[in-house]
């Protein structure tokens, strides 16, 4: 079986880390420096990814696998396989076309990436604000005001509907 397969497709004999060159006697040759083949039986090796500039090397390229990049401090990965690096902002900020901007009142961002999101509207769940929100932190909702008054009924009437996204004043 091995010999039959070899005769049918000589390139099937070449492992990962090599390329198949039918123009020479020894058809399986190791990938040239700075290239790789992850499957074998390939006619060419792929050029290794180079992690330059804002990218830094997380895993070196080998003859059988591509390099993997991440981002230098102050940046974070975006896209499949860290195809882009985006600038970090501070907590309480979001990245805009003009750079990092503070979150508007009523919004927060607790990470160094992503956008500012509205504070939770506690009253939509019939609750009250226990801890006020900041640019870096969401509000903390507590029990409904009715739950806090003595002798209150255990059933809280539904809160009036409000537009989502509005922050408790």
């Amino acid at each position: 079986f091995e010999r039959t397969r070899s005769l049918q497709d000589p390139c099937s004999n070449c492992p990962a880390g090599t390329f198949c060159d039918n123009n020479r006697n020894q058809i399986c040759s190791p990938c040239p420096p700075n290239s790789f083949s992850s499957a074998g039986g390939q006619r060419t090796c792929d050029i290794c990814r180079q992690c330059k500039g804002v990218f830094r090397t997380r895993k070196e390229c080998s003859s059988t696998s591509n390099a993997e990049c991440d981002c230098t401090p102050g940046f974070h990965c975006l896209g499949a396989g860290c195809s882009m690096c985006e600038q970090d902002c501070k907590q309480g900020q979001e990245l805009t076309k003009k750079g990092c901007k503070d979150c508007c009142f009523g919004t927060f961002n607790d990470q160094k990436r992503g956008i500012c999101r509205p504070w939770t509207n506690c009253s939509l769940d019939g609750k009250s604000v226990l801890v006020n929100g900041t640019k870096e932190r969401d509000v903390v909702c507590g029990p409904s005001p009715a739950d806090l008054s003595p002798g209150a009924s255990s059933v809280t009437p539904p809160a009036p509907a409000r537009e989502p996204g509005h922050s408790p004043q």
């Epitope: 020894q26 074998g40 039986g41």
Partner: antibody
């Protein structure tokens, strides 16, 4: 039938270099990578590196990167290995060798070996 | 680098006995693309260069007696000599033929009683 004929034994001083040869016949010299192996007396085999005679592309075992230099002379179908800064640890039999057919399919053709003795 | 570990390092047997030599690699030698294991076995007799016995883990080189068999996959491989003969006295080596540096096992010395 592929044949690999290696140069004769060498008695050399510590700190010096030695150049051994491997003359090939019976096959296309530039068609196959040439391997070099080391075997100390009574010990196992170590792969030193390999060279593609068609373009002198070389792959060296990191352990030997400051020790071995591989080259070829296409006009005489001969491969060479220079071994430098010799110590007693370099006393060994050195083999040149070639893969069987496709490559990565076993080393089927071997020279008879060159015995290098490093002694003051 | 891939580390190849052979066992036993030596064994003494009577002619006609069955012998198994084990070889373990620190990384898989199985190429997923073609489901082939790049593991080679050699026989070396005193004063001679090694001789290729088996390549791709189980393919016997032409001219090698059929009492030599290779098996295994991934990281665990075995060389079996079904009925040892006097001329099998030698050292047997396994080798990673998958990726350079093409490392060898430490060898198994076979002696005949």
């Amino acid at each position: 039938q592929a044949q690999l004929q290696q140069s004769g034994p060498e008695l050399v001083r510590p700190g010096t270099s030695v150049k051994m040869s491997c003359k090939t016949s019976g096959y296309s010299f530039t068609g196959y990578w040439m391997h070099w192996m080391k075997q100390r007396p009574g010990q196992g085999l170590e792969w030193i590196g390999m060279i593609d005679p068609s373009n002198s592309d070389t792959r060296l075992n990191q352990k030997f990167k400051d020790k071995a230099t591989l080259n070829v002379d296409k006009s005489s179908n001969t491969a060479y290995m220079d071994f430098s800064s010799l110590t007693s640890e370099d006393s060994a039999v050195y083999y040149c060798a070639r893969w069987r057919y496709y490559g990565y399919d076993g080393i089927a053709y071997w020279g008879q070996g060159t015995l290098v003795t490093v002694s003051a | 680098d891939i580390v190849m570990t052979q066992s036993p390092s030596s064994l003494t047997v009577t002619a006609g006995e069955k012998v198994t030599v084990s070889c373990k690699s620190s990384q898989s030698l199985l190429n997923s693309g073609n489901q082939r294991n790049y593991l080679t076995w050699y026989q070396q007799k005193p004063g001679q260069p090694p001789k290729l016995l088996i390549y791709w883990a189980s393919t016997r080189e032409s001219g090698v007696p059929d009492h030599f068999t290779g098996s295994g996959s991934g990281t665990d491989f075995t060389l079996t000599i079904s009925s040892v003969q006097a001329e099998d006295l030698a050292v047997y080596y396994c080798q990673n033929d998958y990726t350079y540096p093409f490392t060898f096992g430490g060898g198994t010395k076979l002696e005949i009683k």
